[in-house]
Interface confidence: medium
């Protein structure tokens, strides 16, 4: 079903409208500052990044998949791992990097048009069923089969911002990626500290709405560097 396929990087790796910017929404979100991550028995800051815990592939970035870090490891402990490049071994599409898919246990380059058609066919054939297979691998039902008929409302699970209704963007919210409101004037936003850091956030904020930009709050200029507050302000 569409449900079954939505949990796959196969969808993430396709051109729009089925593909597009999935995984971490990139510029679509504004990440909360000073967020901490679990690492062993202590919490780590963004500059000492620890792997992101996950339960399903769609909770990871475009270039990641969700799995146990060690072969035969504790099934309850899964983290987002870097995707596998071409000719590397795989067990499902989500393990392969964008532009590739899993065929006969190996990540191979996808002919985008052919592959997209294959997925659309799979969706059509098995629409409404609880389980379906894609390239021979059984996939668990995940998102609602209505996902692509009705745009996601605030709080509903999403893969990318185009899944969400107008005025919402797709951003990580700890347990999943959900549709959140685009930020209004005066609301707290976040400038990323370094390139790519948006991909590490547990709680992400949307971008500022039209005509607004994320800038340091006037009365916070004197504050210490770490506690500077950014808000959405008129250009």
């Amino acid at each position: 079903t569409l449900n079954s396929v939505l949990n796959s990087n196969a969808i993430k790796n396709l051109p729009p409208p089925l593909g597009g910017a999935a995984g971490h929404p990139g510029s679509a979100v504004s990440a909360a500052p000073g967020i901490l991550y679990p690492g062993g028995n202590k919490y780590q800051t963004i500059d000492n990044y620890q792997p992101y815990p996950c339960a399903e592939d769609e909770e990871c970035g475009t270039d990641e998949y969700c799995a146990s870090p060690t072969r035969g490891g504790d099934a309850g402990v899964q983290i987002c791992l870097a995707c596998r490049k071409r000719r590397k071994r795989c067990m499902r599409h989500a393990m392969c990097c964008p532009g590739n898919y899993c065929k006969n246990g190996i990540c191979v380059s996808s002919d985008q048009n052919h592959f997209r058609g294959e997925i659309e066919e799979t969706i059509t054939e098995s629409f409404g069923n609880d389980h379906s297979t894609l390239d021979g691998y059984s996939r668990r039902t995940t998102l609602s089969s209505k996902m692509y008929h009705t745009k996601g409302q605030e709080g509903s699970v999403c893969l990318r911002s185009s899944d969400c209704a107008s005025g919402l963007c797709c951003a990580r919210h700890f347990w999943s990626k959900i549709c959140k409101p685009v930020l209004k004037e005066g609301q707290v936003c976040t400038k990323h500290r370094r390139k790519g850091s948006h991909g590490l956030e547990i709680f992400q904020r949307c971008y500022c709405g039209e005509g607004l930009s994320c800038r340091i709050q006037k009365d916070h200029h004197q504050a210490s560097n770490s506690s500077r507050l950014h808000t959405c302000q008129r250009h």
Epitope: P38, G152, R205
Partner: antibody, heavy 116, light 111 residues
Framework: QVQLVESGGGLVQPGGSLRLSCAAS????????MSWVRQAPGKGLEWVSG????????HYADSVKGRFTISRDNSKNTLYLQMNSLRAEDTAVYYC?????????WGQGTLVTVSS | DIALTQPASVSGSPGQSITISCTGT?????????VSWYQQHPGKAPKLMIH???NRPSGVSNRFSGSKSGNTASLTISGLQAEDEADYYC???????????FGGGTKLTVL
Amino acid sequence: QVQLVESGGGLVQPGGSLRLSCAASGFTFSSYWMSWVRQAPGKGLEWVSGISYSGSNTHYADSVKGRFTISRDNSKNTLYLQMNSLRAEDTAVYYCARMGIDLDYWGQGTLVTVSS
Amino acid sequence: DIALTQPASVSGSPGQSITISCTGTSSDVGGFNYVSWYQQHPGKAPKLMIHDGSNRPSGVSNRFSGSKSGNTASLTISGLQAEDEADYYCQSWDVSPITAVFGGGTKLTVL
């Protein structure tokens, strides 16, 4: 509009079992994580358990781990909480809550009383 | 275990402003920069009033505002009204396993 209706509460003896249900309507149930939160009489809120939209991922508070099981039936738009080996301290109003942007919608709750 | 600490009670007169604090640790309130606030009237279900520390869900009065400084989050209610009398809970999230953590609650009395 969003509606969550809990049922299945009642009086049960220590060591007994009970199964709570939460019927959801007004939203696409299978697109949301869901959870159970309880409140003992005159006390504060305590998160009990959460479940992913697909049901493949579950989380529990330490106080109920191994005794309670959260599950869902997306075809019936229903959330469940199977409670076994009940103790007096499990006496509370049990709320079903949608995990949208945090716990954004709550049911009215169902009272579970564990007493001999 | 994570704990969020709130004052047991606060009070104010109609029209006044009151602030309820919620103090946590670097692994919850301070670290996540993420706190929610819920209002609960006697015998009723809790209602989400503030999420993401300072954002109001639609339908919530703009008299309610949230902020955070260090490991302390605050809920401010301005222009206090009789119907604001209720219990207020702050809430944050623990990381692993996913667990919602609530403060002990604050009873607001409108004098």
